[in-house]
């Protein structure tokens, strides 16, 4: 399955929007820094089967969408930028969704797929619990925004690797 050219443009736009969402200096939030243990191994090559990689990317973006579409995020972040961000993520999801559906039944290792989906889910659980613990403070959102930028960049790198393998 070939992701459309607009997909990588959308990725870049989403990253730019995340960068623009910054409301306070990260330096004022150093005490709130947290290691969310990004599941790096799920984004390494490790004989990554394409069908599985696309499903993992889809899960990553779906969880990002859900994280940023809560009433708490609307209160903490710029609504106009959020709305634009939703549009980009929605497009990403549509692109990946059609790819996942084309590759349906192609996953060779269901157990590896389960582990990957669960690893991404747990990563976002850690982020969700962190925000809850910090009572959705502006610093907590700044830490999370920076973390999602990092994870988004890593997702983009995986997509580039998939493209170069075609």
């Amino acid at each position: 399955c070939d992701l459309p050219q607009t997909h990588s443009l959308g990725n870049r736009r989403a990253l730019i929007l995340l960068a623009q969402m910054r409301r306070i200096s990260p330096f004022s939030c150093l005490k709130d820094r947290h290691d969310f243990e990004f599941p790096q191994e799920e984004f390494d090559d490790k004989q990554f089967q394409k069908a599985q990689a696309i499903s993992v990317l889809h899960e990553m973006i779906q969880q990002t969408f859900n994280l940023f579409s809560t009433k708490d995020s609307s209160a903490a972040l710029d609504e106009t930028l959020l709305d634009e961000f939703y549009i980009e993520l929605d497009q990403q999801l549509n692109d990946l969704e059609s790819c996942v559906m084309q590759e349906v039944g192609v996953i060779e290792s269901p157990l590896m797929y389960e582990d990957s989906i669960l690893a991404v889910r747990k990563y976002f659980q850690r982020i969700t619990l962190y925000l809850t613990e910090k009572k959705y403070s502006s610093c907590a959102w700044e830490v999370v925004r920076a973390e999602i930028m990092r994870s988004f960049s890593l997702s983009i790198n995986l997509q580039k690797r998939l493209k170069s393998k075609e």
Epitope: S69, L93, E97, V100, M101, I107, Y113, F124, Q125
Partner: antibody, heavy 119, light 108 residues
Framework: QVQLVQSGAEVKKPGASVKVSCKAS????????MHWVRQAPGQGLEWMGE????????IYAQKFQGRVTMTRDTSTSTVYMELSSLRSEDTAVYYC????????????WGQGTLVTVSS | EIVLTQSPATLSLSPGERATLSCSAG???????LYWYQQKPGQAPRLLIY???NLASGIPARFSGSGSGTDFTLTISSLEPEDFAVYYC?????????FGQGTKLEIK
């Protein structure tokens, strides 16, 4: 508000199949995995599997692999759980429950569908 | 598969008393993925506590959760008449997700 409405009770003969539906409303249907959990009379809860309504991929508990099929219809925001080769031990209330994270994990359940398997 | 064993199977107490329900896991469960549900006859389960110790929305403060590793506890500080029900612990730390067999809290 989030609502999950399930289909009505069913009576089936051993060896037959049953298909239970769960219609979702009050949220973006394709954004959350939907799970199926069953409960035999007077017994505990048992997780059967889950489906991502966005693309239809499924993860099933090993115990039900080969007998359960979860599908979805995005046009009606409905997920389905079909169980085949029914036996008397499959008599249970079947629930759909929405996934999520933190306080949203299984925070929303359908009302349950009683499936009775009897000859 | 992570087996969750709840004890006691039945707990008979009076309103106003303190209830302590246990959930023991066959192998270690990360506290972030341990949940508690309440179920009343003829109803679907209701989320009480998420991630071991966090109260779900609308749940009264008399409910609390604690624990780590393989041992988890649900405590109800002072029982109200509406608290008499079946309680389940649940883990989604690894597939397949599992539930305990339940503890029935009944009026003495």
């Amino acid at each position: 508000q989030v609502q999950l409405v399930q289909s009505g009770a069913e009576v089936k003969k051993p060896g037959a199949s049953v298909k239970v539906s769960c219609k979702a409303s009050g949220y973006t249907f394709t954004n959350y995995w939907m799970h199926w959990v069953r409960q035999a009379p007077g017994q505990g809860l048992e997780w059967m599997g889950e489906i991502n309504p966005s693309h239809g991929r499924t993860i099933y508990a090993q115990k039900f692999q080969g007998r359960v099929t979860m599908t979805r219809d995005t046009s009606t925001s409905t997920v389905y759980m079909e169980l085949s080769s029914l036996r008397s031990e499959d008599t249970a209330v079947y629930y759909c429950a929405r996934g999520g994270l933190g306080p949203a994990w299984f925070a929303y359940w359908g009302q349950g569908t009683l499936v009775t398997v009897s000859s | 598969e992570i087996v969750l064993t709840q004890s006691p199977a039945t707990l008979s107490l009076s309103p106003g008393e303190r209830a302590t329900l246990s959930c023991s896991a066959g192998s270690s469960v990360d506290s972030s993925y341990l949940y508690w549900y309440q179920q009343k006859p003829g109803q679907a389960p209701r989320l009480l506590i998420y991630s071991t110790s966090n109260l779900a929305s609308g749940i009264p403060a008399r409910f609390s959760g604690s624990g780590s590793g393989t041992d988890f506890t649900l405590t109800i500080s002072s029982l109200e008449p509406e608290d008499f029900a079946v309680y389940y612990c649940h883990q989604w730390s690894s597939y397949p997700f599992t539930f305990g067999q339940g503890t029935k809290l009944e009026i003495k």
